[in-house]
């Protein structure tokens, strides 16, 4: 159980106040984290409060301004990047968001040694992606879907690709579906460790169907946004990987990396690229039916100036119970011999664990084991492997950092974070300097977040980087809700839940219950993290109980739970929310006439299906930007979990699992449907179809659209959205305004 500190003295209680919706919308109680921008084993950069870029040397204790805020301000820079030789800094301004990760910007290069901006051969604008080489100060950038190279910032550019074309051919950057569902980055190019080679992906979207929607703007006529977007079963992008020698780029030009034969025989994806050395690269490929992944290690052949990927260096990862990997197929972390690697995948018991692969996957040596999961490998050094897991005290929603000594035999394991600030910190991530000489720990909760700096050899804490003192002080007179994380055991399924309780919670009273659901495959909602958000307000001020439940399909509790939803989305996720609600009612403090459910995106889909389940449990509910039919969503995501919408595959369940098919069942609930009209991700089409089905069934419902807003409903729309949803819930629960 995680209880926020309760304050029971009456004298104190009088001075304390509940959270307000305004607090949440203004971000009054937001926290800060500190991630050092490492530039060596013992140095990092950080942007100071007054916007100077400051270099800190941990060993000397010295710090100095490397770039003045005057320079940042002169071009309205919102971001920066130091070249590895420390001669130059790129300054990023005119940020213009595209999709989740992608944006364009204007880039200026500042010469640190000469104290002035680089003139001559300036960068074009806007640029889609720009990065320094790992050594020196070469620049690679993408402009109008083509890749360019500069040996030095002031040099003329060398054009690497020429076929780039908007919405057709993408070089060095992903198309929509690869960005959102496969790479989770804005870039698709990778420098080799010493900057000798540059690898890049080319995505051909020529044959992909286009989603078109209106962007209303301020003009007399709306404009149409067109995005090549493969929905389930549609034609996919065609991907090719090339590598170019950046020292002599014109000599042989880009060389294509061959695709493994077993992958190339049918539709496939490229999933990631990892450089091992300057002359060895590792590519990961995935069949369109995403239960077979191939890791291919390729070597540079000097004589032919080509890349060779021998079959003996192909490693196959296959799932017989679900899809390959978790949300994504994990990436390898290579050891110093430059051929063996560490990787997370399912063990024989169906738990994701670290394995060491020296020759074949079959002979992999399991490094971690147990009925818990290894989540991320942070760093492998000569003698240590740092990773995170949810092993400690068997709470799946925690994250601790562990160190395994791989230099000694047998390897010994140490939890670096488990006992540091045990009550305050149970959910960590880490950021390591070169050779793991030092590292920063960022604790996200359940207490107020704190970031600390540590010695990589001894794990000793060196200093606190950010402890959110102002937040701590601001919260002193706030009546925060209580939070508890517990589990329900139902029919051999463990359902972990987080309950957020009003500050003066009394088990003998009855409270309205709001279920907040996401529930997507490989997601996790029940986490030991700090948050002061909308649901905190609903508990603190409006006296609601809020519950989050991780049901079947969610992550980090083994493959049985994770893959339970394989090919059957929309069934067990909903069942488990309903089961949990019934258990909560049995606890005795829930008013069963006042139960609501809400969710966003996948959560909007689940909340809609739960409302239409015919159980009579829910009085009302909200779906924000829901998926309504899996035929409307992206191929890469949907097919991973559902297969193809074809007769000989899984069309039947595609049809059975739509929200529209259950339109009649909304008759006895109050339903609020919300969507942004410019949602590039879950298209407005989804809500349009729900609305049409409800109208055709003559079912009353409420709806709100947000013109020109995407899947995030940001800016002023956020305020409007939460105000609107609050009114809806208060009305549903008969709470006075």
């Amino acid at each position: 159980i995680v209880l926020r500190p309760s304050r029971v003295h009456n004298s104190e209680e009088n001075t304390m106040r509940a959270l307000t919706l305004k607090d949440i919308l203004n971000g009054t109680f937001s926290y800060k984290t500190f991630f050092p921008n490492w530039i060596s084993g013992q140095e990092y950069l950080h942007q100071s409060a007054d916007n100077n870029i400051v270099l800190y040397n941990i060993e000397t204790g010295q710090s100095y301004t490397i770039l003045s805020n005057r320079t940042m301000k002169s071009v309205n820079a919102s971001n920066y990047g130091l070249s590895p030789d420390r001669q130059f800094v790129y300054l990023e301004s005119d940020y213009s968001k595209l999709w989740r990760y992608s944006y364009t910007a204007t880039y200026y290069i500042y010469d640190l040694s000469n104290g002035e901006f680089v003139r001559g051969n300036e960068l074009p604008r806007p640029i889609q992606y720009l990065c320094w080489s790992p050594v020196g100060s070469k620049l690679a950038y993408v402009y109008q879907n083509n890749i360019y190279l500069k040996q030095r910032p002031g040099d003329p550019p060398f054009q690497i690709t020429f076929n780039g074309r908007e919405n057709k051919i993408f070089n060095g950057i992903p198309d929509w579906v690869y960005e959102e569902e496969m790479l989770a980055t804005k870039y698709a190019l990778w420098w080799s460790p010493n900057g000798k080679f540059l690898a890049y992906a080319e995505f051909n979207d020529t044959d992909i169907p286009v989603i078109a929607y209106s962007y209303y703007g301020d003009e007399q006529y709306p404009r149409t946004i067109n995005i090549p977007y493969p929905k389930a079963g549609a034609k996919n992008p065609v991907v090719r990987i090339f590598i170019i020698d950046t020292t002599y780029p014109a000599y042989v030009g880009p060389q294509e990396v061959p695709v493994p034969a077993m992958i190339a025989s049918s539709d496939y994806y490229f999933s990631w690229l990892t450089w091992v050395t300057d002359e060895r690269v590792c590519l990961q490929w995935l069949k369109r039916v995403q239960n077979v992944s191939v890791l291919s290690i390729c070597d540079f052949r000097e004589d032919w100036q080509t890349w060779d990927c021998p079959k003996t260096q192909e490693h196959i990862e296959e799932s017989r119970t679900g899809w390959a990997g978790g949300f994504f197929v994990s990436t390898p972390v290579f050891s110093y011999d430059a051929i063996s690697y560490y990787k997370i995948f399912s063990d024989k018991d169906g738990y994701k664990h670290i394995h060491y692969i020296k020759d074949t996957v079959e002979n992999a040596i399991q490094i971690t084991s147990g009925k818990w999961e290894a989540i991320n490998i942070f760093r492998v050094t000569q003698d240590s492997l740092f990773y995170s897991s949810n092993e400690f005290e068997e709470y799946p929603g925690r994250r601790n950092i562990y160190r395994i000594s791989i230099g000694s035999y047998p390897p010994s394991k140490k939890c670096v974070t488990c006992h540091l600030r045990k009550e305050r910190c149970q959910y960590y991530t880490a950021s390591f300097s070169d050779y793991a000489k030092y590292y920063a720990l960022v604790c996200y909760g359940p207490g107020i977040p704190i970031s600390t700096l540590h010695d990589g050899r001894t794990d000793q804490e060196i200093k606190i980087l950010e402890e959110n003192k102002e937040l701590e002080n601001a919260l002193k007179n706030i009546q925060l809700p209580k939070e508890e994380i517990k589990k329900l055991e139902v029919d051999e399924i463990t359902l972990w839940y987080k309950m957020i309780l009003p500050p003066q919670f009394d088990r003998s009273k009855k409270y309205p219950l709001l279920i907040q659901v996401y529930g997507g495959p490989c997601s996790q909602s029940v986490r030991s993290v700090f948050a002061v958000n909308w649901i905190s307000y609903l508990a603190s001020k409006e006296g609601m109980v809020i519950a989050l439940v991780d049901g079947r399909g969610t992550a980090f509790q083994g493959d049985k739970l994770l893959y339970a939803v394989y090919r059957k989305l929309g069934v067990y996720e909903v069942e488990d929310q309903i089961t949990a609600v019934r258990k909560f009612i049995e606890m005795g403090f829930i008013d069963e006439k006042r139960i609501a459910i809400w969710g966003w995106s996948y959560g909007g889909y689940v909340s809609s299906l739960a409302l239409a389940s015919g159980t009579g449990l829910f009085k009302c509910g909200i779906a924000v930007a829901p998926v309504s039919s899996w035929e409307y969503y992206a191929s890469v995501y949907t097919e991973r979990f559902m297969g193809l919408p074809t007769k000989d595959d899984n069309l039947e369940h595609y049809k059975n699992s739509t929200v529209m098919a259950r339109a009649e069942y909304f008759r006895n609930v109050d339903y609020l449907l919300i969507h942004g009209t410019a949602d590039d991700n879950v298209h407005f089409q989804n809500s349009a179809q729900i609305a049409k089905a409800l109208v055709n069934a003559q079912v009353d419902f409420q709806a709100m659209w947000y013109s020109d807003q995407n899947h995030g409903l940001s800016g002023l729309s956020t305020n409007h959205l939460y105000t609107h949803m609050t009114h809806f819930l208060k009305q549903c629960f008969s709470l006075s305004d």
Partner: antibody
Framework: QVQLVQSGAEVKKPGASVKVSCKTS????????IHWVRQAPGQRLEWIGG????????NYNQKFKGRVTITVDTSASTAYMELSSLRSEDTAVYYC?????????????????WGQGTLVTVSS | DIVMTQSPDSLAVSLGERATINCKSS????????????LAWYQQKPGQPPKLLIF???TRESGVPDRFSGSGFGTDFTLTISSLQAEDVAVYYC?????????FGQGTKVEIK
């Protein structure tokens, strides 16, 4: 009045190194980069390299890379230029000069004040 | 590297007469963003360091007599001494500070005829 005062003349043997200092005064040291320029007898002025005292980062002319090291001691408002593996062609007067840091994108400044020069003679 | 070429190499002018020195750069020194030319002129007298006369091709450094003027843009520049004085006997150098490495012209020696 701004001053850049250089160390005295040096006579060095081929293969040796020379380190010339440039002590500055009466201005804010970290607001100007320091550059080193040499002038061999009857030759044009030749830029060797420079350094930004604000961050200690040097920049060298490729011609001298590997042989020259430019450093600063901000506490003493002094810049240093060390040239190694000396040869007879390195016989020249070596000047330090200051150049205002251009914080703005539209700026860019010439070298407005120079040291008096240091004669370095390389002879066996 | 940008190559700077001065002409003539030497120049003899009578006192009170106009002296004109040309400087040509191998690439443009005009910066499109601010429409400024990154070119400076220096005067060097025997046994002395160079002294800045003109920057941005045509702006006089403070304290420099107004008989010294600079003109030109792009790749072609001129330093003019409108009325030569005895104290103007020196070597004059043009220098580009558009990009690195900084480069100088070979110098023009101005003498009295």
């Amino acid at each position: 009045q701004v001053q850049l005062v250089q160390s005295g003349a040096e006579v060095k043997k081929p293969g040796a190194s020379v380190k010339v200092s440039c002590k500055t005064s009466r201005y804010t040291f970290t607001e100007y980069t320091i550059h080193w320029v040499r002038q061999a007898p009857g030759q044009r002025l030749e830029w060797i390299g420079g350094i930004n005292p604000e961050n200690g980062i040097p920049n060298y002319n490729q011609k001298f890379k590997g042989r020259v090291t430019i450093t600063v001691d901000t506490s003493a408002s002094t810049a240093y230029m060390e040239l190694s593996s000396l040869r007879s062609e390195d016989t020249a007067v070596y000047y330090c000069a200051r150049r205002r840091i251009a914080y703005g994108y539209d700026e860019g400044h010439a070298m407005d004040y120079w040291g008096q020069g240091t004669l370095v003679t390389v002879s066996s | 590297d940008i190559v700077m070429t001065q002409s003539p190499d030497s120049l003899a002018v009578s006192l009170g007469e106009r002296a004109t020195i040309n400087c040509k750069s191998s690439q443009s020194l005009l910066y499109s963003r601010n429409q400024k030319n990154y070119l400076a002129w220096y005067q060097q007298k025997p046994g002395q360091p160079p002294k800045l006369l003109i920057f941005w091709a045509s702006t006089r450094e403070s304290g420099v007599p107004d008989r010294f003027s600079g003109s030109g843009f792009g790749t072609d520049f001129t330093l003019t001494i409108s009325s030569l004085q005895a104290e103007d006997v020196a070597v004059y150098y043009c220098q580009q500070y558009f990009s690195y490495p900084l480069t100088f012209g070979q110098g023009t020696k101005v003498e009295i005829k």
